[in-house]
């Protein structure tokens, strides 16, 4: 029986151009975590295998940094990064647990203000 639960940061927001840490935590189970997959809708961002290390999808390699821990750091955020992110925990013997995080990337008011008064 799967007894575990995934705790996530839930709904989070960050400024355009900034970075954010996506973090999940599996609790209430003694199952061994073999791998964590990070996905955004239908896209694979990264895989962290407990023994084999990290795989970063090439389309994200310049903007994704592994860690901290089993988490994932998204950098140079754009408004297009707004959306659902999933942490998929592969465990033994329980099977798969999935957590959801919703990220909203906001236009930076500072950046907008700076752009409006930029000296040519």
């Amino acid at each position: 029986m799967m007894t575990g639960t995934i705790e996530t940061t839930g709904n989070i927001s960050a400024e355009k151009g900034g970075s954010i840490i996506l973090q999940c935590h599996l609790s209430s189970t003694t199952a061994q975590v073999t791998q964590v997959n990070w996905e955004q809708q239908d896209q694979l961002l990264a895989i962290c295998n407990a023994d084999l290390g990290w795989h970063i999808s090439p389309s994200f390699k310049d903007r994704v940094a592994p860690g901290p821990g089993l988490g994932l750091t998204l950098q140079s955020l754009t408004v297009n990064d707004t959306g659902e992110y999933f942490c998929i925990y592969h465990t033994y013997p329980d099977g798969t647990y999935t957590g959801r995080i919703f990220l909203e990337v906001l236009e930076s008011s500072v950046a907008e203000h700076g752009a409006r008064f930029q000296i040519p």
Epitope: N37, E39, H55, S57
Partner: antibody, heavy 119, light 107 residues
């Protein structure tokens, strides 16, 4: 340039063990995970497992768990795969292969070691 | 375990032909898929990684596409040196698995 050079062909009796070596050069062995893949005559490639030389973590296919042992001697830049309790179905070419930096595809391969199990 | 089914298992084509090989995964593997070329008596060589990225030094006639469970490998204009067996490989989850291979021959 990156090179993976494997030990020579082996002929073993059923029930025996074999240890295949893989000498890495042209890169730092601790920077890439090393995997072992085998290919029986006329068969598909089969992943045995992988070892992360940086932290010593190993991952095995369930099929080989308990029978295969992957190790790395970082000072000698050499990876090893030992397979015990050999049977005729283990007759195959065994390859060491490394995964790319921060990727899981297998970008460099050894030349292969033929292991024949026969009574 | 994730099963990888390649088709066809063998095919014969002429020099200059467009050749397409498909690989179907038994479950979603996103884009965690690579393609390899293996010539007789030699080790496999990486051609395509992450479903659609051509590996360094691989000629542009080789390409890959797909995501999820269905993947395609294409040689846009077959050359004599392309005679080999081609394998797909999923690394979405362990144990990593390979397709049964497609043996390519020249007509």
């Amino acid at each position: 340039q990156v090179q993976l050079v494997q030990s020579g062909a082996e002929v073993k009796k059923p029930g025996a063990s074999v240890k295949v070596s893989c000498k890495a050069s042209g890169y730092t062995i601790t920077e890439n995970t090393m995997h072992w893949v085998r290919q029986a005559p006329g068969q598909r490639l089969e992943w045995i497992g992988g070892i992360n030389p940086n932290q010593g973590g190993t991952s095995y296919s369930q099929k080989f768990q308990g029978r295969a042992t992957l190790t790395v001697d970082t000072s000698a830049s050499t990876a090893y795969m030992e397979l015990s309790s050999l049977r005729s179905e283990d007759t195959a070419v065994y390859y060491c292969t490394r995964s790319s930096y921060y990727r899981y595809d297998l970008d460099y391969w050894g030349q292969g070691t033929t292991v024949t199990v026969s009574s | 375990d994730i099963q990888m089914t390649q088709s066809p298992s063998s095919l014969s084509a002429s020099v200059g032909d467009r050749v397409t090989i498909t690989c179907k995964a038994s479950q979603d593997v996103k884009t965690a898929l690579a393609w390899y070329q293996q010539k007789p008596g030699k080790a496999p060589k990486l051609l395509i990684y992450s479903a659609s990225y051509r590996y360094t030094g691989v000629p542009s006639r080789f390409s890959g596409s797909g995501s999820g469970t269905d993947f395609t490998f294409t040689i846009s204009s077959l050359q004599p040196e392309d005679i080999a067996t081609y394998y797909c490989h999923q690394h979405y989850t362990t144990p990593w698995t390979f397709g049964g291979g497609t043996k390519l021959e020249i007509k």
